[in-house]
Amino acid sequence: LVPHLGDREKRDSVCPQGKYIHPQNNSICCTKCHKGTYLYNDCPGPGQDTDCRECESGSFTASENHLRHCLSCSKCRKEMGQVEISSCTVDRDTVCGCRKNQYRHYWSENLFQCFNCSLCLNGTVHLSCQEKQNTVCTCHAGFFLRENECVSCSNCKKSLECTKLCLPQIENVKGTEDSGTT
């Protein structure tokens, strides 16, 4: 099966790598613009230079292209706790990340929020916190894991999933209550 190509891909495939087909004259292949620049004017003829201009401040192109405009630089989302790792340059978009001892929770492929890594109080670190994953904790006896925090079994209600982990404690509490009714 032949993969489906978009119009731009079809046009580009006619020309050698690093060149694109002139939009008004399909017998001319123009040289693509370098990263950090954009297409101002197509080349006037074969072997003649494409008119490429450098991206203005606040915009970029990260690869060779024949874009009519540079792409706008991304802004790190402060409301998501993001910080700027590196500023936008003409040939590279802004790089956003999280502070030390934080991890990224991805709401979608292009949106993440920063959260503090769990410290595993009343437990031990099973897997260390990573860029895109919170610490995985293992709880000490008498504690159960709820939303990645070790919570005392005294907070375990019978309807919750903690009942198996906290069964001895629940039995003890029940036994104590029963012994006081004689």
Epitope: H105, W107, S108, L111, Q113, F115, N148
Partner: nanobody, 121 residues
């Protein structure tokens, strides 16, 4: 076919409460992050709150922190927004939205038709 149907909007006095619901169908609800987004008259869209698949991770806009609570019931395929201490500036159409998984120009791929919340005395 994906469908998101909001309900629970209405007219409420300042300081009052409302609970919005969003009934989801046409997809595996528990596998997707969900959101509430609002649009006030003549203004742009504002993210209100997000909730993760299992409900453990949430996001709230600063303007609603401490007043609104997002929750979900995956067994009922329903998303909720409990709105307390409502203010005039909360007046807007509230939309339930499903996060897209793959990269798109928008982070949401499906929206409900919206429910109007009016806060006025």
């Amino acid at each position: 076919e994906v469908q998101l149907l909001e309900s629970g909007g209405g007219l409420v006095q300042p300081g009052g409460s409302l609970r919005l619901s969003c009934a989801a169908s046409g997809f595996t609800f528990g596998e997707y992050n969900m959101a509430w987004v609002r649009q006030a008259p003549g203004k742009g869209q504002e993210w209100v709150s997000f909730i993760s698949t299992g409900g453990h991770v949430t996001y709230y806009a600063d303007s609603v922190k401490g007043r609104f609570t997002i929750s979900r019931d995956n067994s009922k395929n329903t998303l909720y927004l409990q709105m307390n201490s409502l203010r005039a500036e909360d007046t807007a159409v509230y939309y339930c939205a499903k996060f897209s998984v793959r990269f798109r120009s928008s982070i949401f791929d499906y929206w409900g038709q919206g429910t109007l919340v009016t806060v006025s005395s």
